[in-house]
């Protein structure tokens, strides 16, 4: 076990922030708390990439290039706190990715490639207090799916291009319900709605033809 | 590790405001939460609010909703809580503390004692 | 809010004593629990995490137990530089809550 040889380790801190880095390093002590990844040149998260790592607190992949994620590459990270994926080529959250991570509380996933949300994302996620979706390629999201985020204090929605069709009356219902969405989330279409916050927009003008 | 530095002792009139700031050092806290607490002479621990600098957007306890305003300069990689409308109740050390999560303290600042008189 | 009792308020020991802090919440909190100590004229220090995780650099003569309303800090054999206020907090629900503190005084 050791600290990778670009990086500095510290009070079960591991810092790689800037290194060049293509993969997650591997052999890292078991005891850490933190590993900080960002603005590297990792483009694959495998399977099992932190599971050795039972007490992780914080990662923080931001600004890699990061398009593959294994379903299983935070598997028992059940102390994890904050996971920070912002800035990177995601295009889907596989299944079961978030599973058992109950103590998380930040969810960064802002400018990345998502295009769908399966419904049962987000699960387990009944601490998540932030979960930031901003400038994704969403164009609607599932009746259900932030059902599980019970402690949801913060969400940002904006930046994606939303259809706001009667697939998404929920979500206007949702937003009046918790104005938690301070983004400023709006439609992309049709275009009697374009432009328009959807959290402010009459439920009964999400329509399908 | 992120350090925190703060900005020096304030005394302050009744009915003005004040602004304490928050300095990173030996590392960026872009993407952490960073919070305000603040300590009465003798007394416990109050949680203010916190913010998350690349998001911009804070959140704030009830009690100081209105009162406090907690902001983050990016550039420079500093946070200020900004609080106004003192009263002498509000003598008290504002610290500010950054951690994993929203709500848990790693690291803390050195404190600044703000003192409300006339 | 969630509130946070400490018991006692203060107590005194002696050096190599076994000092058991408690720490009641006003509803579950599941393990969302942290422990910090604070000493005179300094920002408090982070202890525990997650009810019973010990914060790198924290002598293991600190440990910490219980889930859901009932929590437990304990120093099995106090030294000098333990003499100080402990906090326990809850970090499951917004707004993070402490509890009133426990002082811990030379016998």
């Known amino acids: 076990l050791h600290c990778p040889a670009a990086c500095t380790c510290s009070n079960n801190i591991v810092d790689c922030r800037g290194k060049g880095l293509t993969e997650i390093p591997t052999n890292l002590p078991e005891t850490i708390t933190e590993i900080r990844l960002e603005q590297n040149t990792i483009k694959v998260i495998p399977p099992g990439a932190f599971s050795p790592y039972k007490k992780l607190r914080r990662i923080d992949l931001s600004n890699n290039q990061i398009s593959e994620l294994a379903p299983d590459a935070f598997q028992g990270l059940r102390s994890l706190n904050s996971l920070v994926l912002y800035g990177n080529k995601i295009t889907e959250l596989p299944k079961s990715l978030f599973e058992g991570l109950f103590s998380l509380q930040l969810l960064l996933l802002n400018a990345n490639k998502i295009n769908c949300l399966r419904v049962d994302a987000f699960q387990d996620l009944h601490n998540l207090n932030l979960l930031s979706l901003y400038d994704n390629k969403l164009q609607t999201i599932a009746k259900g799916t932030f059902s599980p985020l019970r402690a949801i204090q913060t969400m940002h929605l904006a930046q994606n291009p939303f259809i706001c069709d009667c697939h998404l009356k929920w979500l206007a219902d949702y937003l009046h319900t918790n104005p938690i969405e301070t983004s400023g989330a709006r439609c992309t279409s049709p275009r009697r709605l374009a432009n328009k916050r959807i959290g402010q927009i009459k439920s009964k003008k999400f329509r399908c033809s | 590790q992120v350090q925190l530095v703060q900005s020096g002792a304030e005394v302050k009139q009744p009915g003005s405001s004040v602004k304490v700031s928050c300095k990173a050092s030996?590392?960026?806290?872009?993407?952490?939460?960073v919070s305000w607490v603040r300590q009465a002479p003798g007394q416990g621990l109050e949680w203010m609010g916190g913010i998350i600098p690349i998001f911009g957007t804070a959140n704030y306890a009830q009690k100081f909703q209105g009162r406090v305003t907690i902001t983050a300069d990016e550039s420079t990689d500093t946070v200020y809580m900004d609080l106004s409308s003192l009263k002498s109740e509000n003598t008290a050390v504002y610290y500010c503390?950054?951690?994993?999560?929203?709500?848990?303290?790693?690291?803390w600042g050195q404190g600044t004692l703000v003192t409300v008189s006339s | 809010d969630i509130q946070m009792t400490q018991s006692p308020s203060s107590l005194s020991a002696s050096i190599g004593d076994r000092v058991t802090i408690t720490c009641r919440a006003s509803q579950n909190i599941n393990s969302y629990l942290n422990w910090y100590q604070q000493k005179p004229g300094k920002a408090p220090k982070f202890l525990i995490y997650a009810a019973s995780n010990l914060q790198s650099g924290v002598p293991s003569r600190f440990s910490g137990s219980g889930s859901g309303t009932d929590f437990t800090l304990t120093i099995s054999s106090l030294q000098p530089e333990d003499f100080a206020i402990y906090y326990c907090q809850q970090s499951y629900r917004s707004p993070p809550t402490f509890g009133g503190g426990t002082t811990v005084e030379i016998k």
């Open positions: 030996g590392g960026s806290f872009r993407s952490y939460t």
């Open positions: 503390a950054t951690g994993s999560g929203w709500y848990t303290f790693d690291y």
